[in-house]
C-alpha cells in the first residue's frame, strides 16, 4: 500500500493553521488498525504515534518551512512511509505602517504619560518596531514581537519631548516607515511676576505707570488679568507667550496693592502683590509714589 501526505492549505501564510493528512488511496484505514506519525525533517510532530490520520497545526511560522512526511504502522508492526512533501510557509511583508498617540491628537500635558502606538495593517511573523524622534532620526527604542502593534511609552512628558516622531516596522522584507506625527506638550503657566515700571524713579500723579506681568513658563496663548486691590483693571493677551503690559495713568487713588493673574486654559496662577505707596517728599509740591 502507498502512503501520501496532504497538507491543507499547501502554501500556508504565517500564523495560519495547517492540517496534515496521511492518506492511503488503496486501503481504508478502517480495514486495519493503524497508528500514524508525522515528521518534519527528522523530528516527530505533535503527540507522536496516534490513531488519527490527521494532525492539526494551529499556526505555521516561517521557521516551520521544511520537508514533511508521515508514517503508518499496522498492528503487525509493518511501517509504511510517505514521500516527503515540501511545505513553504509564506511571510506577508509589513504594509501600511501608522503611528498613533495616546492621548489622541498628539497633545499632552507636561508630566502626563504619552504612548506612541506603532501599527501595521498587514505583516506576519516577528515584526521589529522602531521609534524615532525628529526627522533627524534619533532612535528611541526597538521591539520585536509577533503582533501587529507595539507601544513606546514616555511615562512623564517633558517640554523637550515636543517633537515629530515616526516609527518603522520590518519583518525581513525591508523597513517601512509611518508618517510623521507631531507631539505638542502643553505646559501650565508658572506663577507670574508683576513689575511696575514708571518713567522715573519716583512716579508722580499723572505719570503713566506700566504694569508688566510675565509667566516664565506656559504654553501660549496666555491671558493676563491685572488687579488693583482685587478689582479688575483689565486684561491683555500674549498669543505667542511671553509677558503683557497694562498702562495706567496715575491718580492719588492708585496707591495700594497690585497683582496679576496668568491663565492659558491649563490652570491660572496669581502673582505676588506689589505695593505702591504715595510719599510726600519734604518741600515738594506734588505727591509721589513708590513701590
Amino acid at each position: 500500500a502507498e502512503l501520501f501526505l496532504i497538507a491543507s492549505p499547501s502554501h500556508p501564510t504565517e500564523g495560519s493553521p495547517v492540517t496534515l493528512t496521511c492518506k492511503m488511496p488503496f486501503l481504508q484505514s478502517s480495514d486495519a488498525q493503524f497508528q500514524f506519525c508525522f515528521f518534519r525533517d527528522t523530528r516527530a510532530l505533535g503527540p507522536g504515534w496516534s490513531s488519527s490520520p490527521k494532525l492539526q497545526i494551529a499556526a505555521m511560522w516561517k521557521e516551520d518551512t521544511g520537508s514533511y512526511w508521515c508514517e503508518a504502522q499496522t498492528m503487525a508492526s509493518k511501517v509504511l512511509r510517505s514521500r516527503r512533501s515540501q511545505i513553504n510557509v509564506h511571510r506577508v511583508p509589513v504594509a501600511d505602517v501608522s503611528l498613533e498617540t495616546q492621548p489622541p491628537g498628539g497633545q499632552v500635558m507636561e508630566g502626563d504619560r504619552l504612548v506612541l502606538i506603532c501599527s501595521v495593517a498587514m505583516g506576519t511573523g516577528d515584526i521589529t518596531f522602531l521609534w524615532y524622534k525628529g526627522a533627524v532620526g534619533l532612535n528611541l527604542q526597538s521591539k520585536t514581537q509577533r503582533s501587529l502593534t507595539a507601544e513606546y511609552e514616555i511615562p512623564s512628558v517633558r517640554e523637550s519631548d515636543a517633537e515629530q516622531y515616526y516609527c518603522v516596522a520590518e519583518n525581513g522584507y525591508g523597513p517601512s516607515p509611518s508618517g510623521l506625527v507631531s507631539i505638542t506638550v502643553r505646559i501650565p503657566v508658572s506663577r507670574p511676576i508683576l513689575m511696575l515700571r514708571a518713567p522715573r524713579a519716583q512716579a508722580a500723579v499723572e505719570d503713566v505707570l506700566e504694569l508688566h506681568c510675565e509667566a516664565l513658563r506656559g504654553s501660549p496663548p496666555i491671558l493676563y488679568w491685572f488687579y488693583h486691590e482685587d478689582i479688575t483693571l483689565g486684561s491683555r493677551s500674549a498669543p505667542s507667550g511671553g509677558g503683557a503690559s497694562f498702562n495706567l495713568s496715575l491718580t492719588e487713588e492708585h496707591s495700594g496693592n497690585y497683582s496679576c493673574e496668568a491663565n492659558n486654559g491649563l490652570g491660572a496662577q496669581r502673582s505676588e502683590a506689589v505695593t505702591l505707596n504715595f510719599t510726600v517728599p519734604t518741600g515738594a509740591r506734588s505727591n509721589h509714589l513708590t513701590s
Partner: antibody, heavy 119, light 107 residues
Amino acid sequence: QVQLQESGPGLVKPSQTLSLTCTVSGGSISSGGYHWSWIRQHPGKGLEWIGYIYNSGSTYYNPSLKSRVTISEDTSKNQFSLKLSSVTAADSAVYYCARLVGVTYFDCWGQGTLVTVSS
Amino acid sequence: DIQMTQSPSSVSTSVGDRVTITCRASQGIRSWLAWYQQKPGKAPKLLIYAASSLQSGVPSRFSGSGSGTDFTLTISSLQPEDFATYYCQQANSFPPTFGQGTKVEIK
C-alpha cells in the same frame, strides 16, 4: 562631524569579486538609528542603492543585486565593507558609502571611489 | 520598486532666477522624500529631508514642498554655486530609490 572614506581596488577583472571598505570617523557605526549603506552611480547616470548594514550585522540588499551582494562590518575598526561577486562591465561605477538616518535619508557620504571592471 | 520621475531633466537658467524642479512618485510616499545636490566629481549632498525640512547648513534659498506623489524643490534666487545636478529620493517603500536627476546649467 561624521566622515566616511571608501577604499579598495579601482580595477577588477570580470567574473571576480569587487571588494570595498568604508572607514567611519567622528562617530561609531554601532550607534543606534543609523544604517550604513552602499550606493553606486554609473558614469553619467543616476544613483542606485545597493544595500545597508545595521544593528550589529543585520543587512538589507537591493533585490536587483541581492544574489551577488554581501555587506559586513568590523566594529573594532569602525568599518563596513561591500563585496559584489561575479562582476561584469555593467558594474563599473563610482561606489559611495553613506549613512542612512532612520531608514529615510542619506545625510553623510564618502567622496566615492571609481571601480572599473575590465580584463 | 517605486519609480521616481524628475522634470525637467535639464534646465538652462541664470544667476538670480527662481528654479523649480519637480519629482513624481509612482505611488504615494507620504512625506518621505529627500533632495540632494551633486556637483561633478563630488558626492551628493543632502539639501532637504522629509519633503520640506532644510538640512543644517543649507542656505534658506532652497525649499521643498509636497506630499503623496508630487514634490517640488525650489531655489528662490539661483547663485553661481547652485549649478549642479539635483536628485530626489523616496524612503517610504523598500528599496529606497532615486530620481534620474535634473541638471541645472548656466544659460
